[in-house]
């Protein structure tokens, strides 16, 4: 080890290690946590502050409208009464109380954040960790959704409602247990030495956890995706030999990809950036993440809010569900759907049956 | 090797203003807080503030808010203090110092500045 | 703020002595202590932090206790380089306070 200074041979630079005993601070002050971590805790509303909180409740009213509207389609459209349905109104659920629990971070973000203990802290956080869980889980249960749609050769699964409530009380639960693991233990309240910066009374560990555990599910989704769309790939190009069709081929497998596009690209675009911060802020002591953080928190927020327009807004069904909703008409042919109903655009399941199973189209 | 290198002595006028600065080597500047502390002749260690590179984010003893402002150059790995509207008061060695440990705030320090003596006189 | 009181304010000892010093807070600062060794013209170097870790290439014979309020640094078979200004501070947050002081001579 260098000596510290030139003035003393005696003392040379030091080997900090953690406090020989074990101390909790749990009825510490956050300006405590935060002061230790070097984030700025601001003590009086600034420009930023001001226009972070002016578009975030803008996004959340957004999102809580949006998601409520998806919801209430797929609960007065008997047409949506089929698992990928039920899915998509659990993604909104899980998207209305990321708005939620966004709403709640805003009234306590800034200045206020000074006014919370340690528990209102925690419970702040965990419903943010638990919304985007719940999201994210959500995204993936989709996601494997479409993927057994596909290779069983369905236009619906055969999942039973049973085994969808199952799911969805899976996704629940595993959003519930995610974002209450630091409030039952793991933080550095008792760990002051491995705080982080950007959540100053969490664990370096568990921001590491968390942005690994996420960015897997991401790569898990292009996987299955990718898988997806190499089977239909490969099933388009052996039928265009066999029939006359091969247009509209190109244009399920342009349809297709589109629509992964979309909802890969969203995912990327507003998660990406987030976690790659929450890596960099443990695994890089030279970077300044906290100048970046609430935007990126904001973006992966609009992940939320870009949710019910790409699995639902894109669907001509979903839109004129909405239609109904926000014009309080009645539905017409609340039975099935009209021979000419374009669902396939969006609802990636009815893309490729569209093309691959080209006779199943009209089964629901 | 670990180092704080400080500017010399500054001899100033009552009312002016000066500006101190702390050139760290041999480890990475923004990974540590910087702290700079006042004493005077014959007596004890007074906290004035700190700077953390990383964040730009800084903390004052409110004895010295509006009396020092403290900044950082990460090009140059350079801690500044400047302090103005200089009294006889003001009269004094100030060290700077760094942090114990890095990417957080401990509030102690391990590494020290040789110090800069400040004297104001007319 | 919290404030410092060390004790005593000057202490005369001879070589192989054993010294304690002694620091006061204001308030709860559970095991925020640093000890800190001053000579002469020279830079202050942190001894203890945390109450009681020694500092990397600090002689064991130095040792530091006490949590909360109360807290000392125990120097034992004092050595030459030994003697100085030891001063004692919290490092809880900001803002940071130091102990007057305790110059510690040789007899």
């Known amino acids: 080890m260098a000596a510290a200074s030139t003035s003393s041979p005696v003392i040379s630079q030091p080997q900090f290690t953690a406090m020989n005993e074990q101390q909790c601070f749990y009825n510490e002050s956050i300006a405590f946590f935060y002061n230790r971590s070097g984030k700025y805790l601001a003590t009086e509303w600034n420009t930023v502050s001001k226009l972070v909180m002016g578009l975030g409740i803008t996004v959340c009213v957004f999102i809580m409208l949006a998601n409520l509207l998806v919801m209430v389609a797929i609960y007065v459209n008997r047409r949506f009464h089929f698992p990928i349905y039920y899915l998509m109104a659990n993604l909104a659920a899980a998207d209305f109380f990321a708005g939620l629990a966004y709403f709640y971070l805003m009234f306590n973000t800034g200045p206020n954040t000074r006014r919370l203990t340690v528990s209102t802290w925690l419970l702040r956080q965990g419903l943010i960790d638990t919304s985007l869980t719940a999201s994210v889980a959500n995204l993936l249960a989709i996601a494997i959704e479409r993927h057994i749609t596909v290779f069983r050769m369905q236009l619906h699964t055969r999942m039973s409602n049973r085994r969808v409530v199952v799911v969805i009380v899976v996704i629940w639960t595993m959003a519930i247990v995610m974002g209450a693991i630091p409030s039952v233990g793991w933080n550095c309240i008792c760990d002051i030495d491995h705080c982080s910066n950007m959540a100053p009374l969490y664990s370096d560990s568990y921001l590491v956890f968390w942005a690994i555990f996420n960015l897997v599910t991401f790569v898990v989704m292009v996987v299955l995706y990718a898988h997806i769309f190499g089977y239909v790939r490969q099933r388009t190009m052996r039928m265009s030999r066999h029939s006359s069709g091969p247009r509209r081929n190109r244009d399920t497998m342009m349809s297709l990809l589109k629509t992964v596009v979309i909802v890969l690209g969203a995912f990327i675009v507003c998660w990406t950036p987030g976690l790659v911060l929450l890596l960099l802020d443990v695994c890089c002591p030279q970077c300044d993440v906290l100048a970046y953080e609430k935007f990126f928190l904001l973006l992966a927020e609009f992940n939320s809010a870009m949710n019910p327009i790409i699995y639902s807004y894109r669907d001509k069904e979903m839109s004129a569900t909405f239609r109904q909703i926000l014009c309080c008409q009645r539905n017409e042919n609340p039975n099935g759907p009209t021979e000419g109903s374009d669902r396939s655009a969006s609802s990636l399941n009815h893309t490729i049956l569209a093309g691959v199973h080209s006779n199943d189209h009209s089964v629901v | 090797q670990v180092q704080l290198q400080q500017s010399g002595a500054e001899l100033a006028r009552p009312g002016a203003s000066v500006k101190l600065s702390c050139k760290a080597s041999g480890y990475t500047f923004t990974s540590y807080g910087i702290s700079w502390v006042k004493q005077r002749t014959g007596q004890g260690l007074e906290w004035i503030g700190e700077i953390y590179p990383r964040s730009g984010n800084t903390y004052y003893n409110e004895k010295f808010k509006g009396k020092a402002t403290l900044t950082a150059d990460k090009s140059s790995s350079t801690a500044y203090m400047e302090l103005r509207s200089l009294t006889s008061e003001d009269s004094a060695v100030y060290f700077c110092?760094?942090?114990?440990?890095?990417?957080?705030?401990?509030?102690?320090?391990?590494?020290w500045g040789t110090g800069t003596t400040v004297t104001v006189s007319s | 703020d919290i404030h410092m009181t060390q004790s005593p304010a000057s202490l005369s000892a001879s070589v192989g002595e054993t010294v304690t010093i002694t620091c006061r807070a204001s308030?709860?600062?559970?095991?925020?202590l640093a000890w800190y060794q001053q000579k002469q013209g020279k830079s202050p170097h942190l001894v203890v932090y945390?109450?009681?870790t020694l500092t990397e290439g600090v002689p064991s014979r130095f040792s530091g206790s006490g949590s909360g309020t109360h807290f000392s640094l125990k120097i034992n078979s004092l050595q030459p380089e030994d003697f100085g200004i030891y001063y004692c501070?919290?490092?809880?947050?900001?803002?940071?306070?130091f102990g007057a002081g305790t110059k510690l001579e040789l007899k």
């Open positions: 501070q919290h490092h809880y947050g900001p803002p940071l306070t």
């Open positions: 110092a760094r942090e114990s440990i890095s990417r957080r705030l401990g509030w102690n320090f391990d590494v």
């Open positions: 945390n109450a009681k």
């Open positions: 308030e709860n600062i559970y095991s925020f």
